[in-house]
Interface confidence: medium
């Protein structure tokens, strides 16, 4: 039970006194007793509860006529079971006795008030009074935990806006107030209880940049709600008529959990003492909710897709004409961004990671965009966000960035076990140098720091600063698959590719040709492939360095081999020793349930089949997966990124909720 | 799990060096950095530096700047610390331990050298 | 150089007892890169912590870690016969500047 404030009586004139209902209020009355006294007895009116413990060892006892020792040791509590009609309607009345005086009386008048503030913090998506519920101070994760949540209201409600909901002082409408969290305040008082309180709403300076709160006036339209805290408002004085009211307050959070926030807000509710105007207002009663700020989440490629974005470029018609095909199989909505919006840059993976916000009562894709700002640099803002689609940026939006702050560098596991440790939501996986040094590249702090605070998918850094662009995604996906874990992790993996050649040419084939029926592509034997002693040792360089990363993601996802997939795949350095793909990199892979497209490798024909094809088909197919080979050459490959690079993926959220795990 | 085993026990000369050898077992010896760690007698313990096979870079903190080297060896999986210039206060156990994290974090421990610097 | 403090040198408690062994950093460590180390005489340290709250393999679960920023707390919830020992944190963020703290002692009342 909440702490009420301490009364002290005296015998010298009636003490009056606020009880709030649900909390217990200690009464003082040894320090202004008659001197000769040794003893007390204490009579209540009905709705007042008296708990007496003498200890110790504490002997406690509801009120009767018995006296009781007049010490220190001796604790009076009082709890009100009910709010008064008028003030002063409950009477305590205390009787010192000593041995030689008749008995002394203290009079005290209690006014017993209703003030809570409710929100959802039981995470039902209902506000319920919290009465006798669990203290809502205090925020915890876990299936039995509780405590309210907030969403970044990140989306653009109004179309002809070019900003964030957040961002204004206003309720646009319904649809705006549903993207912000309800809280109640409800008050029982005497009718007059008010001309000598007031109740304030406040939240701490530290917050108050983090959240904003609007107060509804009940029964009119949503324009009639007006901001009452945020960024220039840490306090509030309330307009309350004394009886029995509701208030309804609806606050949506301004700011993601980030280095400098970890995400909690507090707002408080206090009742102030206003009756004496030569004192400062006395806070009688406070009462808080916490509030967690709902992380950004990402989904993994095992979550169904349901909208595919890529863009339309220069004679690239027939690769959209290949996803156009695969999203069609997958029922997926597509959205190409055109020529003139794209300013010729194709890298729509890179350009944004599209995640979700999730409060029990609302989920909110966002679309986190990257600091990479090439020719997509407006597409995330102008076309990605808008109504119940949300935005999300970080890191410098003016240079001081490299390639590894583009997103084919940011992906994320399926959820995983490690060790006993649950991440139910997965782990993120980014790439960053091997060793800080004056020429590798990482991903900017700013990002790092944004993904880390979300708390829910703790990141891994990977090794990824040895490719020539740097992606994660140039050498590793992860696929859906039935048995195990649910799915599988494809590397990129030389080693299986030269094996894959070997066994051709042992079986004959040496003279069949890699790029064949590819125009002016010098076309490549499997034998002078095999031969190439540069490209050897090339490729066992790009072994190890995938080799590092297959034990880091075996230790940090908790993965076994049979876990694991390798998928035939050639690099070559190029300068300044990185790598990039020889041929179409296979494991740049577009993942739409167990529809995938995959670039086409143009591997030497055998038998009328392209071994490399074959060869993953072989591996893929027995997963329930279809392989659909998609020509990127020309369009992409040359320009170093591939099918995955090309396009991006707006998957279904996770039906686990985040605010049940334990990070 | 790796197994590291380390050479014997030394007794030196201040103003010589020693050489301390680390070898690997139980796993691919390039996939792991290996670290040397020290605890001088009473004293906590102290990170002198650590090298990455794979890409022969070798790190050492400001106090060892100039006076450890480490190197490794792929062929045969095995780690050297080579400490010169001794002085009496080097008396202390020697530890290689590996890592499988671009940070130095150490997981697998060798068993712990002991190095005495004496007249 | 991040300089790490442990607190507090010596800890002297009762089996069964909990133990709370505080480190606190001279700056924030990146990413939380903070480990923690078990010692026993003549024994090699034994990682128990990583990532401030990650249980390496085989380590019991009333051995848990917590923390961020600057400040980082090892518990033991219910002191085993073998907990007896030396503990130290470790900060692996600021590569190459790896630096352990003075260790804590935690000794059998």
């Known amino acids: 039970m909440a702490q009420g404030t301490l009364i002290r009586v005296t015998p010298e004139q009636p003490t009056h006194a606020v009880c709030v209902l649900g909390t217990l209020t200690q009464l003082d009355i040894c320090s202004s007793a008659p001197e000769d006294c040794t003893s007390f007895s204490i009579n209540a009116s009905p709705g007042v509860v008296v708990d007496i413990a003498h200890g110790p060892p504490a002997k406690k006892k509801s009120t009767g006529s018995s006296t009781w020792p007049l010490d220190p040791g001796v604790e009076v509590t009082l709890t009100m079971k009910v709010a008064s009609g008028s003030t002063g309607d409950q009477k305590v009345q205390i009787s010192y006795y000593g041995p030689k005086t008749p008995p002394v009386k203290a009079l005290l008048y209690l006014t017993g008030v209703e003030i809570s503030l409710c929100a959802d913090i039981t995470r039902t998506g209902k506000v319920k009074p919290t009465r006798a519920v669990k203290d809502q101070r205090t925020w915890t994760w876990g299936p039995c935990g509780q405590g309210a949540i907030l969403l970044v209201n990140c989306d653009r409600d109004n179309l002809e806006s070019s900003a964030m909901d957040c961002e204004d002082d206003e309720v646009l409408d319904s649809e705006d107030l549903q993207d912000m969290s309800l809280m109640t305040l409800s008050t029982k008082t005497p009718k007059d209880f008010f001309t000598n309180h007031t109740l304030v709403l406040h939240v701490a300076r530290s917050e108050m940049d983090k959240v904003r709160v609007f107060q509804a006036t009940r029964g009119k339209l949503s324009s009639k709600c007006s901001v009452v805290l945020g960024p220039k408002w840490p306090s509030h004085y309330l307009m309350v008529p004394g009886g029995k009211h509701n208030m309804d307050f609806y606050v949506e959070a301004l700011a993601f959990p980030d280095t400098d926030f970890p995400g909690l807000i507090t707002l408080t509710i206090s009742l102030l003492d206003t009756s004496n105007l030569e004192l400062p207002e006395a806070v009688v009663f406070q009462d808080s909710v916490v509030f967690r700020v709902a992380p950004w989440i990402m989904t993994p490629n095992t979550q169904p897709p349901q909208e595919v974005y890529a863009c339309s470029i220069f004679e690239n018609e027939d690769f959209l004409k290949s996803v156009t095909t695969l999203a069609m199989k997958a029922k997926c909505k597509l959205t190409i961004c055109p020529e003139e919006e794209n300013m010729d840059d194709q890298w729509m993976q890179d350009e944004m990671e599209i995640g979700y916000i999730q409060a029990p009562h609302k989920t909110l894709p966002v679309v986190f965009d990257s600091p990479r700002n090439r020719g997509l640099k407006e597409f995330p803002i102008k076309r990605v966000m808008g109504p119940d689609f949300g935005y999300v940026t970080r890191g410098p939006q003016t240079g001081g960035i490299s390639g590894l702050d583009s997103f084919g560098n940011l992906e994320v596991s399926p959820p995983v076990t490690v060790r006993g440790k649950e991440y139910p939501l997965g782990r993120i996986l980014f790439g960053d140098s091997c060793y800080p040094s004056n020429d590798s590249r990482q991903m900017h702090q700013a990002l790092q720091d944004f993904l880390s605070a979300q708390q829910v998918q703790a990141p891994v850094k990977l090794y990824s600063d040895w490719l020539s662009v740097g992606h994660v995604d140039e050498f590793l996906s992860f696929v859906p698959a039935p048995d195990r874990k649910g799915f599988r992790l494809l590397l990129a993996s030389p080693r299986s590719c030269y094996k894959l050649f070997q066994e051709q040419q042992n079986e004959g084939h040496g003279e069949a040709l890699l790029f064949e029926g590819i125009k002016k592509k010098k076309q490549q034997k499997i034998k002078n492939i095999l031969s190439n002693k540069t490209l050897r040792e090339h490729n066992s360089f790009v072994e190890r360095c995938i080799d590092w990363n297959r034990e880091l993601l075996k230790r940090e996802l908790g993965l076994a081999e049979s876990d694991i997939i390798d998928i035939p795949q050639l690099f070559k350095l190029k300068e300044f020793s990185k790598a990039e793909a020889f041929f179409p990199n296979m494991v740049n892979m577009l993942v739409l349930g167990k529809h995938l497209g995959i670039p086409k490798p143009f591997g030497p024909v055998i038998n009328g089949r392209c071994c490399l094809e074959e060869k993953v088909c072989s591996l893929l197919e027995p997963l329930g997966l279809q392989c659909t080979f998609i020509n990127d050459f020309f369009t992409y490959h040359i320009r170093h990124g591939e099918v995955h690079c090309g396009t991006n993926v707006r998957r279904k959220p996770f039906s686990f909720k985040w605010w049940n795990m334990v990070p | 799990e790796v197994q590291l085993v380390q050479s014997g026990a030394e007794v030196k000369k201040p103003g010589s060096s020693v050489k301390v050898s680390c070898l690997a077992s139980?796993?691919?010896?390039?996939?792991?950095?290996v670290s040397w760690v020290r605890q001088a007698p009473g004293q906590g313990l102290e990170w002198m530096g650590g090298i990455i096979p794979m890409f022969d870079i070798a790190k050492y903190p400001q106090k060892f700047q100039g006076r450890v080297t480490i190197t490794a060896d792929e062929s045969t999986s095995t780690a050297y610390m080579e400490l010169s210039s001794l002085r009496s206060e080097d008396t202390a156990v020697y530890y290689c331990?590996?890592?499988?994290?671009?940070?130095?974090?150490?997981?697998?421990w060798g068993q712990g050298t002991l190095v005495t610097v004496s007249s | 150089e991040i300089v790490l403090t442990q607190s507090p040198a010596t800890l002297s408690l009762s089996p069964g007892q909990r133990a709370t062994l505080s480190c606190g950093a001279s700056?924030?460590?990146?990413?939380?890169?903070l480990a923690w180390f078990q010692h026993k005489p003549g024994l090699a340290p034994r990682l128990l912590i990583y990532?401030?709250?990650i249980r390496a393999t085989g380590v019991p679960d009333r051995f848990s870690g917590s923390g961020s920023g600057t400040d980082f707390t090892l518990t033991i919830s219910g002191l085993e016969p073998e907990d007896f020992a030396v503990y130290y944190c470790q900060q692996y963020g600021g590569s190459p500047q790896i630096t352990f703290g003075g260790g804590t002692k935690v000794d059998i009342k």
């Open positions: 700056q924030p460590v990146s990413s939380n890169y």
């Open positions: 139980g796993g691919t010896f390039n996939n792991y950095a």
């Open positions: 990532d401030t709250s």
């Open positions: 331990a590996t890592s499988y994290f671009r940070q130095w974090l150490t997981w697998d």
